[in-house]
């Protein structure tokens, strides 16, 4: 059974899906492999935290290091790449911060998107010094392992030079890379030895191997390709957001909830009220009014504007955003005050995201 | 590793009520939606409706509300799907699935005879 | 509701074979959909979600695309294993609606 009870009827679900919100995400915290990552819990005053990867918990082990409010990863690979939540249980609440590891390499190897600096890599070489091919900046081929996520583009380089100008050729996994082998194709640019692939998935991880040769020798190099998955989640809403509020009688206020969701998300503004002089219903239950929620009719359903305030709008303003998978809620205060008193911006607090326990 | 484990088969009569349980266990009950999805025999797949365990939030498909009540109880980390006024249609498969629907029930055959 | 209308309903293809389903939903639903394999006396299993993301541990032989109202799914060589039903679904808006299924038949 719903944990409150709604005011009035209101169609809850929208008639035509919004547009797509991909509007905040969490924060992003990146370590290369083999590298160690230590993130600390940004939740205040926890009595108990517990740490989730995918919504799985997680437990300490042999890599995985949990100590008060730090979580430490030793030698992260690709696969703890993933959305992590620390959850700090207090006597009254609890309340869970979300934040994302990504384990990977630089999207290109070592070098920017642009190639702008791509023009130094083009070696001219006097006609009369035959030379087998070389690789003129092994700083650009350091790094063998790539582990990037799904749908971002990936650009391996083999910076090379010989007399006559050597050819350069791709292997995948060690067979001839061919245009069919992946949806879309890929790039090859020979003045910047380059080759590129956007938008990867997952079944683009292998060994990439750069084949350059001319009729005096021939050099090649291996690049490792992993491309980490996502998993679909539920939504999640940028921390401190909505942010507690105060303005004056007759003045006006916005609340502001930021969303991110793979998914299409369905946003509702909802507030505590009163029904015959009671907050709570019959069962217990606390009164619920719908005052906004995502939807044909609905414009911008990530910020609730309120105009012309009386103390009767003071009070809690919950953002609760829900897709298919599950659902999550922040909520804020509104102080109303007199008008003889100048309002102010409250210092912006998160209230525990479950409100409704 | 995740895993929801459904009840029993069931036989009914028709008028009756029948209620399917759905036990979840490797991943945090609370964060995850469950789907109750139904698949009469020979036919296709049909969404009932769904149930967010943290707070008890329902939705429903409009062709179930009011016969299907979907309930979750966070200490057992179990769902539950009842279906009442059964009718000989109603003789089906029933899948609960998590939110991402990533991960299936093996299933719950109800029959409905006289 | 927003329905969704799948075809063909039925396909013999060849082992090695590309198979192409499609998906037509009524309303626009962004790339909320997700696509099904399911085998006889068993459930449904999760190949793609969000149109275009194959779920962890999927062979890549299996690929979704499309936006909006116009959907695809691809076996790109087709294997003995893969006969089965396959599923769409939209997971935009409620109720959650699926396609009424490809059945999949070696020729």
């Known amino acids: 059974r719903p944990s409150f009870s709604l005011v009035e009827d209101t169609t809850l679900e929208p008639e035509e899906p919004p547009t797509k919100y991909q509007i905040s995400q969490p924060e992003v915290y990146v370590a290369a492999p083999g590298e160690s990552l230590e993130v600390r819990c940004l939740l205040k005053d926890a009595a108990v935290i517990s740490w989730t990867k995918d919504g799985v918990h997680l437990g300490p082990n042999n890599r995985t290091v949990l100590i008060g409010e730090y979580l430490q990863i030793k030698g992260a690979t690709p696969r703890d790449s993933g959305l992590y939540a620390c959850t700090a249980s207090r006597t009254v609440d609890s309340e869970t911060w979300y934040f994302m590891v990504n384990v990977t390499d630089a999207i290109s190897s070592g070098d920017d998107e642009d190639d702008t600096d791509g023009a130094e890599d083009f070696v001219s070489e006097n006609s009369n010094n035959k030379r087998a091919p070389y690789w003129t900046n092994t700083e650009k081929m350091e790094k063998r392992l790539h582990a990037v996520p799904a749908a971002n583009t990936v650009k391996f380089r083999c910076p090379a030079g010989g007399n006559p100008m050597p050819t350069m050729r791709w292997l995948k996994n060690g067979k001839e890379f061919k245009q069919e082998h992946r949806i879309g194709g890929y790039k090859v640019r020979n003045q910047h030895w380059s080759l590129i692939m956007e938008s990867v998935v997952p079944s683009d991880k292998g060994n990439y191997t750069c084949v350059v040769e001319n009729e005096y020798g021939s050099i090649n190099h291996t690049y490792h390709l992993d491309v980490v998955e996502r998993s679909p989640h539920r939504p999640i809403l940028q921390a401190g957001l909505p942010a507690n509020a105060s303005t004056v009688v007759g003045g006006d206020v916005e609340f502001v909830c930021k969303v991110y969701s793979d998914a299409q998300p369905h946003i509702q503004w909802i507030k505590h009220v009163e029904k015959n002089g009671s907050k709570y219903g019959p069962d217990g239950l606390p009164y619920l009014k719908v005052l906004k929620h995502s939807g044909i009719n609905s414009s911008n359903a990530e910020v609730l504007a309120l105009f012309n305030v009386t103390e009767a709008d003071a009070g809690e303003y919950i953002c609760k955003v829900s897709n298919y998978i599950g659902q999550a809620n922040q909520s804020a205060w509104l102080t109303v005050l007199p008008k003889q008193q100048a309002p102010g911006r409250e210092k912006e607090i998160t209230a525990s995201p479950d409100y409704l326990e | 590793q995740v895993q929801l484990v459904q009840s029993g088969a069931e036989v009914k009569k028709p008028g009756s009520s029948v209620k399917v349980s759905c036990k979840a266990s490797?991943?945090?009950?609370?964060?995850?939606?469950v789907h109750w999805v139904r698949q009469a025999p020979g036919q296709g797949l049909e969404w009932i409706g769904s149930?967010?365990?943290?707070?008890?939030?329902?939705s429903y498909n409009q062709n179930y509300r009011g016969r299907a009540t979907i309930t979750a109880d966070k200490s057992t980390s179990t769902a539950y799907m009842e279906l009442s006024s059964l009718r000989s249609e109603d003789t089906a498969v029933y899948y609960c699935?998590?939110?991402?629907?990533?991960?299936w029930g093996q299933g719950t055959l109800v029959t409905v005879s006289s | 509701d927003i329905q969704m209308t799948q075809s063909p309903s039925s396909l013999s293809a060849s082992v090695g074979d590309r198979v192409t389903i499609t998906c037509k939903a009524s309303?626009?639903?962004?790339?909320?959909i997700a696509w099904y394999q399911q085998k006889p006396g068993k459930a449904p299993k999760l190949l793609i979600y969000?149109?275009?993301y194959r779920y962890s541990g999927v062979p890549s032989r299996f690929s979704g695309s499309g936006s909006g109202t116009d959907f695809t799914f691809t076996i790109s060589s087709l294997q003995p294993e893969d006969i089965a039903t396959y599923y769409c679904?939209?997971?935009?808006?409620?109720?959650?609606?699926f396609g009424q299924g490809t059945k999949l038949e070696i020729k």
């Open positions: 149930i967010y365990p943290d707070n008890g939030d329902s």
């Open positions: 699935a998590r939110g991402d629907f990533a991960y």
């Open positions: 309303n626009g639903i962004s790339n909320d």
């Open positions: 679904q939209q997971h935009s808006t409620t109720p959650y609606t």
């Open positions: 490797g991943y945090i009950f609370t964060s995850y939606n």
């Open positions: 969000s149109a275009s």
